[in-house]
Every structure is written in structure tokens, then in C-alpha cells.
């Protein structure tokens, strides 16, 4: 059973199989690819509110802190990602743990993550149609980032 | 021309053509999938150092700066990683952009991103023996984050 | 026509640091990585480092770690190397050569600047 | 890291000759071999990449072949402007290693 991996499926290693020789749960088990973010979620409530925790996973203790929001498309490898939400718009003070320091500004920073989408191969019809990988950037944000603020020049 | 995913090279959707058929040219053309790291760096030496710039890309900003090295295999997809190197032990203060705090943690976030490697498949061998894609998790730091000491209980 | 001009040749003493050019034209410089190779004695070649020009990234030879340091300046198509505490082993000939790309695979340094001569005296 | 070896440091042939230089590399490579030709000057030039593909505008009488840990590069009929120092460099890992070079010179 395999999938035709292509560029805007229309060339690259390729090979194709039928719906029908394809059951979603193996299509499934290959796009799970990464279904976690980075870090553990928080099993307490933390990371929701603009505050740093001294405890628990790393994006509730960040001065910058973020939750994350689960993305699932079934038809995409992976099918799961997870989007970074800043909390706070400036960074939290140290000291206090829940202050914000107008100093600072808590921002995302952004990746374009390649995914792969399942489409139907092209000139394919029917019942038995194949299907392609059809090759995508997809802008994901992995965190959020304390930073200071830019001075333009 | 296609390739076998697999995990562990012994399930999943599969595919698999002779080495002869695909040409590395081919195979790279996808495992090309992500070759940027998630910013662009500091034109400049800025993250080099332990300081937070006021200009420049978002990890030569943040009081918890890195810069990003290259983790490159051609039989990787995707071929190039980027792996984060924080710079600073402690977070740079926001006032001043140089001097560290000792009460924030410069500290990398980490992910188990999935990757596959071009693998010879079970019970092949000869010239023209094909190739799969065996799954893994790779361990890669995608940025350095600011955070308060655990504290323990 | 792709083309990497290098900097002069440089005469420096023992002990000081040094950065050579190297501008790129005929091409978008962000598109390709730059690599550098150093060439003593006329004869081996040994792979310094490389730099992709679009982000910074960059992946050093374990030899060069903390001799080499890799720039660019985006704004004038310029990659550099900075060489730190020279010695008489650093006296060579130290090339920029572009890294072939065909949109998806880096293959071969396809281009490569005339070489810079940094003789340590 | 990968050693590569040119077991022959230089070599003398005549005008017109078919001439081979080998490269071997400590381990298998994949095929992730490229050869590179430089001049008295200085001045170096990609010739093949990936074991046998010419890259633009190198003249056809240079070929490559291989596999595994041995690779070599032909000359099929040698010219005047192919008295050079060749090199083959190895892209299966990082560092990227070349061998020492392989000179050429007429008889």
C-alpha cells in the first residue's frame, strides 16, 4: 500500500495507490507523524493566564508564556500540529511571576513546517481513484519568544 | 518512482522502487522538506554573543538568544534540521540587553520531530535493491525560552 | 554569469585576526549555501564551514570551531570569514565556493572565488 | 569522518591518452561524490557531480563512475588545457572531506 508523494501532485517520487487498497487507518498510522507538541501540555490551568509558573512544563514557566491549540486535518501529514498562543502581550517579571514588564514583548515565532496533503491524483476517476502527497508550506508558531523591542534605525 | 513507509521498515503504506529507478536526485527532491530554521538569523554576529540585540531576527531579540546549527544527512527526510543553541546560561536583563538575571533560565525547548531515513528494505539485496522510509523521532531544540527556576515541592 | 570575487591577499602578524570576503553576483545571493575550504601548501583542500545566506544557519568542520566564524551581509551579497588568533598553520590559500542547488538538493560546490593567500608572518 | 584516498599523486600521460584517476572513500558513500579540477593558477571548477553527472558546460570527454567506496573519473581523450590537479570530494556527511589530489602532466 503506498501514496504518490508529489509537488502540487504533479511530479516527484511518486506511486499511487487506489482508495480501496488504502483504508484510512493505515493511511492514519503514517500522518500521526507528531501528535504532541513540544512540550507536555500543562495538567493545571497555568499556561491560560498571563502569569510564569515555577512549575510545571516549560510553557507555563516561560516569562513569555503560551497554550497550545491543536490543528487536526486527517488529510494532512501530520495530521496533527499544535499552534504556540501567546498569553500575555509583554513579558511577565521575574521577580513577581504575573507583572508584565512593557520592557519586553512576548511574540511568536513562526515556521513554515512542509506538510503533505492527500489529494486525488490528477486524471484520476472513479470509485477506485488514487490519491497523491501533495507537498505544502504551512505556517505554524512553535512558541513565544520574550524579546526586546525593535528600534528602527 | 516511489519509496516505502515504513515503521521500522515492516508496516505501514508502502512503496518501494529500485534504487536504479530513483535516482538520489529524486528521493532529495522530497526529503528537501524543511531547510530553513524557523527565523532568519542575525546578519550580523549579535547571536553569537550573550546579548539581545535591538534589531534583527527574533533570536538575536529574545533575552533568551540562540543561533541555529546546521544537522544536515541525505538520507534524512527532511535532510536539513536545525537544532537551537542557547547562548546565555540565565536570560538577559531587558534593561540593559547584556547583563544576565540569575532568576530567569535560558533554557532550550525541545521536540521529538519525526523524520525518516532512506533505509534498504527487509529482504533486499543486489544491484538494484529498493528502498524504504523508516519512521523515527529526532530530538531537535527549536528555540531558547526565558523561564522561571522550578521550584520544587 | 555567476561569479564570487574574494578580497586581497593579506599579510597579518601571529596572534591577530582577520576577515576575508567574498561578493557574490549573477545569481540570488539567498539561494544558495556558501561554503569554505582552506588549501595549504598548494595541495589538500579541507572543508572549513558553510553558511546559508537566507537564515544564518550555519555548520562548522570540528577543526575550525573556534578558528572560523561565517557572516553575511545579505544587503550587499557579501559572505565573510573571520579567522581568529593566527598562527604560521594558518597561512593558505582560503576559498568561498557556492553550493550547487537545484531547488530541493544541495550537490556540489559548483562555483568558486579566485582564493585569498593569508600568509601569517 | 570520511577519509578519502587518491592513492596516485600524480601521473603523466600523452595527448590524446584515456586517462583514469580513482578516489576511495573510508566508508560507502552513496554515490555523493563530486570531482573538482584545478589549475596552476589556482582557479577550480566543478567537473562531475554525483558520482558521473557533467555539470554544464564541462566538455563531454570527462566521465565519472562508481559506487560504494570507489569512484573514478576518466579522461577519455586527453588535451593540452586538462593539465590539472583533480580532486574528489565526498557530500555524504558532514564535514564534506576531498581527497589530495591526483596531478596530471604530459609526457
Known amino acids: 500500500v503506498s501514496l504518490r508523494i508529489q509537488e502540487g501532485c504533479s511530479h516527484l517520487p511518486s506511486c499511487c495507490p487506489s482508495k480501496e487498497q488504502e483504508p484510512p487507518e493505515e493511511w492514519l498510522k503514517w500522518s500521526s507523524a507528531s501528535v504532541s507538541p513540544p512540550e507536555p501540555l500543562s495538567h493545571t490551568h497555568h499556561a491560560e493566564s498571563c502569569r510564569a509558573s515555577k512549575d510545571g512544563p516549560l510553557n507555563s514557566r516561560a516569562i513569555s508564556p503560551w497554550s497550545y491549540e491543536l490543528d487536526r486535518d486527517l488529510n494532512r501529514v501530520p495530521q496533527d500540529l499544535y499552534h504556540a498562543r501567546c498569553l500575555c502581550p509583554h513579558c511577565v517579571s521575574l521577580q513577581t511571576g504575573s507583572h508584565m514588564d512593557p520592557l519586553g514583548n512576548s511574540v511568536p515565532l513562526y515556521h513554515n513546517q512542509t506538510v503533505f496533503y492527500r489529494r486525488p491524483c490528477h486524471g484520476e476517476e472513479g470509485t477506485h481513484r488514487r490519491y497523491c502527497l501533495e507537498r505544502r508550506l504551512y505556517r505554524v508558531s512553535l512558541a513565544c519568544v520574550c524579546v526586546r523591542p525593535r528600534v528602527m534605525a | 518512482v516511489s519509496l516505502r513507509i515504513q515503521e521500522g521498515c515492516s508496516h505501514l503504506p508502502s512503496c518501494c522502487p529500485s534504487k536504479e529507478q530513483e535516482p538520489p536526485e529524486e528521493w532529495l527532491k522530497w526529503s528537501s522538506a524543511s531547510v530553513s530554521p524557523p527565523e532568519p538569523l542575525s546578519h550580523t554576529h549579535h547571536a553569537e554573543s550573550c546579548r539581545a540585540s535591538k534589531d534583527g531576527p527574533l533570536n538575536s531579540r529574545a533575552i533568551s538568544p540562540w543561533s541555529y546549527e546546521l544537522d544536515r544527512d541525505l538520507n534524512r527526510v527532511p535532510q536539513d534540521l536545525y537544532h537551537a543553541r542557547c547562548l546565555c546560561p540565565h536570560c538577559v536583563s531587558l534593561q540593559t540587553g547584556s547583563h544576565m538575571d540569575p532568576l530567569g533560565n535560558s533554557v532550550p525547548l525541545y521536540h521529538n520531530q519525526t523524520v525518516f531515513y532512506r533505509r534498504p528494505c527487509h529482504g533486499e539485496e543486489g544491484t538494484h535493491r529498493r528502498y524504504c522510509l523508516e519512521r523515527r523521532l529526532y530530538r531537535v531544540s527549536l528555540a531558547c525560552v526565558c523561564v522561571r527556576p522550578r521550584v520544587m515541592a | 554569469e555567476v561569479q564570487l570575487q574574494q578580497s586581497g591577499p593579506e599579510l597579518v602578524k601571529p596572534g591577530a585576526s582577520m576577515k576575508i570576503s567574498c561578493k557574490a553576483s549573477g545569481y540570488s545571493f539567498t539561494d544558495y549555501t556558501m561554503n569554505w575550504v582552506k588549501q595549504s601548501h598548494g595541495k589538500n583542500l579541507e572543508w572549513i564551514g558553510l553558511?546559508?545566506?537566507?537564515?544564518?544557519?550555519?555548520s562548522y568542520n570540528q577543526n575550525f570551531k573556534g578558528k572560523a566564524t561565517l557572516t553575511v551581509d545579505k544587503s550587499s551579497s557579501t559572505a565573510y570569514m573571520e579567522l581568529l588568533s593566527l598562527t604560521s598553520e594558518d597561512s593558505a590559500v582560503y576559498y568561498c565556493?557556492?553550493?550547487?542547488?537545484?531547488?530541493?538538493?544541495?550537490?556540489?560546490?559548483?562555483?568558486w572565488g579566485q582564493g585569498t593567500s593569508v600568509t601569517v608572518s | 569522518d570520511i577519509q578519502m584516498t587518491q592513492t596516485t599523486s600524480s601521473l603523466s600521460a600523452s595527448l590524446g591518452d584515456r586517462v583514469t584517476i580513482s578516489c576511495s572513500a573510508s566508508q560507502g558513500i552513496s554515490n555523493y561524490l563530486n570531482w573538482y579540477q584545478q589549475k596552476a593558477d589556482g582557479t577550480v571548477e566543478l567537473l562531475i557531480y554525483?558520482?558521473?553527472s557533467l555539470h554544464s558546460g564541462v566538455p563531454s570527454r570527462f566521465s565519472g563512475s562508481g559506487s560504494g567506496t570507489d569512484y573514478s573519473l576518466t579522461i577519455s581523450n586527453l588535451e593540452p588545457e586538462d593539465i590539472a590537479t583533480y580532486y574528489c570530494q565526498q557530500y555524504s556527511k558532514l564535514p564534506y572531506t576531498f581527497g589530495g589530489g591526483t596531478k596530471l602532466e604530459i609526457k
Open positions: 565556493a557556492r553550493e550547487g542547488y537545484d531547488g530541493y538538493l544541495y550537490f556540489a560546490m559548483d562555483y
Open positions: 554525483y558520482t558521473s
Open positions: 553558511i546559508n545566506p537566507y537564515n544564518g544557519g550555519t
